[in-house]
Amino acid sequence: LVPHLGDREKRDSVCPQGKYIHPQNNSICCTKCHKGTYLYNDCPGPGQDTDCRECESGSFTASENHLRHCLSCSKCRKEMGQVEISSCTVDRDTVCGCRKNQYRHYWSENLFQCFNCSLCLNGTVHLSCQEKQNTVCTCHAGFFLRENECVSCSNCKKSLECTKLCLPQIENVKGTEDSGTT
């Protein structure tokens, strides 16, 4: 089975790498524009230069292309706690990230929010906090993990999942009470 190619991919595949087929004349292959530039005018003929212009401030192209417009630079989303790691240049989009001791949680492919790394109070660090993952905590005896915090088993209600984790503790307490002096 031959995979279906879009019109642009079909046109590009006729020309050697780094070139694209002229939209009005499919016998001409024009040189693609370098990153940081965009297509202003197609090449007039074979072996002639493509008219590429540099992206204006606030826009970029990150790879060779034949785009009629540069792409708009991304903005870091303050409401999501994002900070700018590096600003946009003509050939690279803005890079956004999180502050120190924070991690990224991706709500979708192109949206992340910064959250504070868990400190594992009443527990120990099983896996350290990473760029895209919170600390993994292991709780001390008598505590259970809820929303990545170690919470006392005294806050465990019967209906919650914690009953399995806190049950040995509860049984130990009962056992101590039952073994009274005779």
Epitope: K78, E79, H105, Q113, E147
Partner: nanobody, 119 residues
Framework: EVQLLESGGGLVQPGGSLRLSCAAS????????MVWVRQAPGKGLEWVSH????????FYADSVKGRFTISRDNSKNTLYLQMNSLRAEDTAVYHC????????????WGQGTLVTVSS
């Protein structure tokens, strides 16, 4: 006590429009980023859109960009979602929520309103 109450859902034909509302109380609405999420039958939660407190530069998921518009009226403590050019795949329960602060879960979100897109 934080309360979020959605309304405006219903049955609509493909290509049709709906406007969802979310009435908020129990917190300072004008200080909070508000979110619309949806859950299609048998699927997980999907982030649809969010809007910062000042209403500037809202975010839209690629799946709704150009069709949905989020807005807010801070004087009425109300969040809106205008949904145009609706498709069958937009069928879901739509919830409004406060942007999470402590971790990647929703502490405060509404019961939701069902949107069904079908001919």
């Amino acid at each position: 006590e934080v309360q979020l109450l959605e309304s405006g859902g219903g049955l609509v034909q493909p290509g049709g429009s709906l406007r969802l509302s979310c009435a908020a109380s129990g917190f300072t609405f004008a200080h909070e980023t508000m979110v619309w999420v949806r859950q299609a039958p048998g699927k997980g939660l999907e982030w649809v859109s969010h809007i910062p407190p000042d209403g500037q530069d809202p975010f839209y998921a690629d799946s709704v960009k150009g069709r949905f518009t989020i807005s807010r009226d801070n004087s009425k403590n109300t969040l809106y979602l205008q949904m145009n050019s609706l498709r069958a795949e937009d069928t879901a329960v739509y919830h409004c929520a406060l942007l999470p602060k402590r971790g990647p879960w929703f502490d405060y979100w509404g019961q939701g309103t069902l949107v069904t897109v079908s001919s």
